[in-house]
């Protein structure tokens, strides 16, 4: 079950760990507390997951149902262009920086937002149901 490289999509995945939400073939964790972007990334990695990488508009729209006005960190950064943590470019949505310090990406129910990576925000992790399987 759920075999593949690190950046593959999960196949038919069973249940998710405690406090994780199953949606489609992935498990999602919506944090209660707030951390900066780097600390949020570390939290996800420590749980064999990754900061949320959104694959398409459909996944984004579905996830936004579970979000509020509050922004959540996702696995999106501006390193000479907005890229997801799996290395893929952001190509199905738009995000713009209003200042040079806004190099990390966040999401709320209304869409994507560029932010300084230092701001403490909620975050979303994503993983396959089994720890040793694909992250995205």
């Amino acid at each position: 079950l759920c075999q593949g490289s690190n950046y593959s999509t999960c196949a038919s995945c069973p249940s998710c760990p405690d406090r994780w939400m199953k949606y489609g073939n992935h498990c999602y964790y919506f944090s209660v507390e707030e951390k900066d972007w780097n600390s949020s990334l570390e939290f996800c990695l420590a749980r064999d997951s990754h900061l949320l990488v959104i694959t398409d508009n459909q996944e984004m729209s579905l996830l936004q149902v579970f979000l509020s006005e509050a922004f959540c960190w996702i696995g999106l950064r501006n390193n000479s262009g907005w890229r997801w943590e799996d290395g893929s470019p952001l190509n199905f949505s738009r995000i713009s920086s209003n200042s040079f310090v806004q190099t990390c990406g966040a999401i709320n129910k209304n869409g994507l937002q560029a932010s300084s990576c230092e701001v403490p925000l909620h975050w979303v992790c994503k993983k396959c149901p089994f720890a040793d399987q694909a992250l995205f």
Epitope: N98, S99, A106, A114, E118, V119, P120
Partner: antibody
Framework: EVQLVESGGGLVKPGGSLRLSCAAS????????MSWVRQAPGKGLEWVAT????????YYADSVKGRFTISRDNAKNTLYLQMSSLRAEDTAVYYC?????????????WGQGTLVTVSS | DIQMTQSPSSLSASVGDRVTITCRAS??????LAWYQQKPGKAPKFLIH???TLAEGVPSRFSGSGSGTDFTLTISSLQPEDFATYYC?????????FGQGTKLEIK
């Protein structure tokens, strides 16, 4: 209600030093970049310095680089500007300003200002 | 460094007039422009960011437009409390440059 209250201004001789403080209230100080902006008598606004949320990154106008130091104490909700080697052209009202949030570096909130006069 | 140039430097107008203030950047700044209002002896007040987005609580008679190098602040119908000095500011990168100001006076 967001409040920024500057203090520490006064008369100082050329070459002297002064430390300005800005006490912040009405918002979570440790979530925002903070800045100092000054205005010489009868002149326009001039950005002086900006500090990141953690204080790990600081940015200065060329006119004050090497002479002024911006710092913050998030536990005390206070922003500082240490000014040294002061010159007559540093005479101005110094305003403390807060960004718009998320690193949006426009100056959304301002203090009332504190006057620094450099004169012999 | 990016330079911001405002015009005119001063302007006389009457209550009810429509007024436009211009700000020009020395190079393309896209929409990274803010506007402020300052009254004598007071701190500046934030009006607009991203060239056209009104700050919370700012009356709808104020509007901003432009992108690239040319920007305008328009007051559709001047009110007595609008007589002040207005500044534009580049807000994307260091240094955060201000225009020299436009003083709006009663005719």
């Amino acid at each position: 209600e967001v409040q920024l209250v500057e203090s520490g201004g006064g008369l100082v001789k050329p070459g002297g030093s002064l430390r300005l403080s800005c006490a912040a209230s009405g918002f979570t100080f440790s979530r925002y970049y903070m800045s100092w902006v000054r205005q010489a008598p009868g002149k326009g606004l001039e950005w002086v310095a900006t500090i990141s949320i953690s204080g790990g990154n600081t940015y200065y106008a060329d006119s004050v680089k090497g002479r002024f130091t911006i710092s913050r104490d998030n536990a005390k909700n206070t922003l500082y500007l240490q000014m040294s080697s002061l010159r007559a052209e540093d005479t101005a009202v110094y305003y403390c300003a807060r960004e718009g949030g998320y690193g949006n570096l426009w100056f959304a909130y301002w203090g009332q200002g504190t006057l620094v006069t450099v004169s012999s | 460094d990016i330079q911001m140039t405002q015009s005119p430097s001063s302007l006389s107008a009457s209550v009810g007039d429509r007024v436009t203030i211009t700000c020009r950047a020395s190079e393309n700044i896209y929409s990274a422009l803010a506007w402020y209002q300052q009254k004598p002896g007071k701190a500046p007040k934030f009006l607009i960011h991203n060239a056209k987005t009104l700050a919370e609580g700012v009356p709808s008679r104020f509007s901003g437009s432009g992108s690239g190098t040319d920007f305008t602040l328009t007051i559709s119908s001047l009110q007595p409390e609008d007589f002040a000095t207005y500044y534009c500011q580049y807000h994307y990168g260091i240094p955060f440059t201000f225009g020299q100001g436009t003083k709006l006076e009663i005719k």
